[in-house]
Amino acid sequence: GSVPPMVNVTRSEASEGNITVTCRASSFYPRNITLTWRQDGVSLSHDTQQWGDVLPDGNGTYQTWVATRICQGEEQRFTCYMEHSGNHSTHPVPSGNSHHHHHHHH
């Protein structure tokens, strides 16, 4: 059967006026997953995102991540889109004072 991913969105300060937002998916099976950043509902192209390999996490499940750099103050325009085993979900960027957003997808 399939194991849905845990999705975690974090933010970190980058260069002046920018932040890096990272979307991590972990503990999922099977390996095939779509994980991408969207701006105003449209996915960014491959060359505006940084991608991690889909790697085994030691529990028979997998993990991966995708990151992009955005302008501070535009966080609300960006969401992380996840699709796995026919299910999908969308995850917002946390506000500046809350650095983690966890969602165990069902």
């Epitope: 449209v42 996915s43 192209s45 491959h46 060359d47 995102q49 940084q50």
Partner: antibody
Framework: EVQLVESGGGLVKPGGSLKLSCAAS????????MYWVRQTPEKRLEWVAT????????YYSDSVRGRFTISRDNAENTLYLQMSSLKSEDTAMYYC??????????????WGQGTSVTVSS | DIQMNQSPSSLSASLGDTITITCHAS??????LSWYQQKPGNIPKLLIY???HLHTGVPSRFSGRGSGTGFTLTISSLQPEDIATYYC?????????FGSGTKVEIK
Amino acid sequence: EVQLVESGGGLVKPGGSLKLSCAASGFTFSDYYMYWVRQTPEKRLEWVATISDGITYTYYSDSVRGRFTISRDNAENTLYLQMSSLKSEDTAMYYCSKGGGSTARGALDFWGQGTSVTVSS
Amino acid sequence: DIQMNQSPSSLSASLGDTITITCHASQNIHVWLSWYQQKPGNIPKLLIYGASHLHTGVPSRFSGRGSGTGFTLTISSLQPEDIATYYCLQGQSYPLTFGSGTKVEIK
């Protein structure tokens, strides 16, 4: 004028190694993603590898991961593809391509003339 | 992986005709689709990026449309110099994938 000039191709035996180079000029090399794409004898185009502008990130097709390494020297304006454990199915024309950057997002806007790689015993 | 299904594999048309080539993506790639022209014995050249934007120096008889999963390249008033093979490429996510190509010939 953007120019990409590949070199280093040739005939190699299965299991052998080869290093391709791509000399770039006419643009600020360090600002752009760079790519290797190959064209098989059947004329099919296949993406091989990508390296990001800051050298930080590299990406590979499943068919070459673990055997090929993409790298760049921003001081010398040169892109490389180190190929090892070569197989007959790696026989192709190898093209160096420049990423479109912010003006042609997601596309490969300039290509070199290619260098031919033949893997045969 | 995203598969790109390109059709037809070849077509023959008369000079002055309008022809359309199609690429279908196996999943939503939004607008991250580019088209390339490869003339016999030559290298691929970018025609269209972002599904509909003409690359610098490309004649206006070339046009691209589509978003999501369905995309078209149209050549209006086919010219002798348009004899080539045309490829689409999805630039949404890795691995980047090309269509299998459409060979355009003159009747």
